[in-house]
């Protein structure tokens, strides 16, 4: 194997999903010592970066100040140590929301059931689409595709209390353009105590932000920005 | 180290099909795009198309759609170039380029010869 | 989509001499890249970014430019020079090649 740098790591800030017309930060975290970072976008070069000094910084910065569909796509980042050039990082997804209209998300039987129950939610949207999301609001920003010509069913089967939280849904026009955000649906699902303390609700954001969870440490950012990576990398597949 | 192998010259007869092949070897093949470029006799370069081995999603320059298929298989770590229907203006040499910081690595070329 | 014109078509060039050739794009592009290619080879990449050396690219090279305006210079001509050299955008669909400038040696 031809010796490569190990892949930087990807992220967007505050998010990858991105309202139309909104500002968002790519982040590419590299090594400290790298005189180059690329940001690609769709296998296409989008913009360079020469951190200077480089032996102090490990980490650019690329903004997009105005959000639209021509910029939602497939993003990665490589960096250069000298002659040396790291593999690409991971895919990200950067996701284009607020486009066009808005669903509504409703559940069966209701927004508090029992553990156990068996739960479905409704995601309906009138326009031009067949692909719906349904998203749990919380750290790991879990991500279910549904299809239907207006409406999506997304059954969650008999629940428990880990599937607590505020749910939204999106319709999808394409895989990097969504609709407006439904209403958030709050499930609560009450079950006995010991269940209840094994499974603990995701963390869950404050009802107006889509925001990426940050922790403070150096290797706590490294592990939450994998993990959104890897939330973004996946949320296509 | 880095090795894209191109399969070897072509003489197909005009109004076939070729698939001309890529192989990579060395590296990663998913993490990559690959480029096709074009270069007829005594002529400079035209792109073809696109593809990550990854997800094997597609761009195409449009004078070649309708022309050109690009596949990959990511089991053999190979990238192929489907042409259809060719005639005399097909006959080129095809080269395959990864890109990295730079279109780092290019296949030798495979010359594509069509006449009947 | 974007046009790149390289000129001159063919230079002659003495060694030692410095020699300057450039690429104009029919709109702003923010990035060239220059690749070498002599007959029967595949191209090699030679200036990426607009001018960053690709690897093993002698530091004789150099290109520079901006928005529709781009050139590679050689500051002292080798034989070995003798190429022909393309400018390239991979920016925007579909991505261009220049027509090529064609080195010769005196």
């Known amino acids: 194997q031809q010796q490569t740098l190990p892949k930087p790591f990807i992220w967007a800030e505050p998010h990858f999903m991105v309202p139309k017309e909104k500002q968002v930060t790519i982040c590419c975290q590299g090594n400290y010592g790298a005189v180059e970072y690329q940001l690609h976008f769709e296998g296409s070069l989008f913009a360079v970066d020469r951190p200077k000094p480089p032996e102090r910084i490990n980490k650019v910065q690329f903004y997009i100040p105005d959000m639209n569909s021509r910029m939602a796509g497939q993003y990665s980042c490589i960096y250069r140590v000298g002659e040396l050039w790291s593999e690409p990082s991971n895919l990200l997804d950067l996701v284009v929301t607020e486009m066009y209209d808005t669903p509504t998300l409703s559940v069966h039987p209701g927004p508090e059931v029992i553990s156990g129950e068996k739960v479905t939610f409704y995601c309906r949207l009138d326009t031009a689409t067949s692909m719906f999301l349904l998203l749990k609001e919380g750290r790991s920003s879990h991500v279910q595709r549904g299809y239907g010509k207006v409406q999506a069913e997304f059954p969650l089967g008999p629940v428990t209390t880990a599937h607590r939280g505020t749910y939204r849904c999106f319709g999808s026009y394409n895989n990097h353009a969504w609709s407006f955000p439904s209403e958030p649906v709050k499930l609560l699902v009450t079950g006995d105590i010991e269940n209840t303390s094994l499974a603990p609700e995701d963390p869950t954001f404050p009802a107006d932000t889509w925001g990426t969870y940050l922790l403070t440490t150096e290797t706590g950012l490294q592990k939450d920005h994998a993990l959104w990576d890897h939330t973004a990398q996946n949320l296509l597949r | 180290q880095v090795q894209l192998q191109q399969s070897g010259d072509d003489l197909v007869k005009p109004g076939a099909s070729v698939k001309l092949s890529c192989k990579a070897s060395?590296?990663?093949?998913?993490?990559?795009?690959i480029n096709w470029i074009k270069q007829r006799p005594g002529q400079g370069l035209e792109w073809i198309g696109r593809v990550v081995p990854g997800s094997g999603r597609t761009y195409y320059n449009e004078i070649f759609k309708g022309k050109a298929i690009l596949t990959v298989d990511s089991y053999s770590n190979t990238a192929y170039i489907q042409l259809r229907s060719v005639s005399s203006e097909d006959s080129a040499v095809y080269f395959c380029a990864r890109v990295g910081g730079y279109w780092d690595y290019w296949g030798q070329g495979i010359t594509l010869t069509v006449s009947s | 989509q974007i046009v790149l014109s390289q000129s001159p078509a063919i230079l002659s060039a003495s060694p030692g001499e410095k020699v300057t050739m450039a690429c104009r794009a029919s709109?702003?592009?923010?990035?060239i890249h220059w690749y070498q290619q002599r007959p029967g080879s595949s191209p090699k990449p030679w200036i990426y970014a607009t001018s960053s050396l690709a690897s093993g690219v002698p530091a004789r090279f150099s290109g520079s430019g901006s928005g529709t305006s781009y050139s590679l210079t050689i500051s002292r001509v080798e034989a070995e020079d003798a190429a022909t050299y393309y400018c390239q955008q991979w920016s925007s669909n579909p991505y261009t090649f220049g027509g090529g400038t064609k080195l010769e040696m005196k």
């Open positions: 060395g590296y990663t093949f998913t993490s990559y795009w």
């Open positions: 709109s702003s592009v923010n990035y």
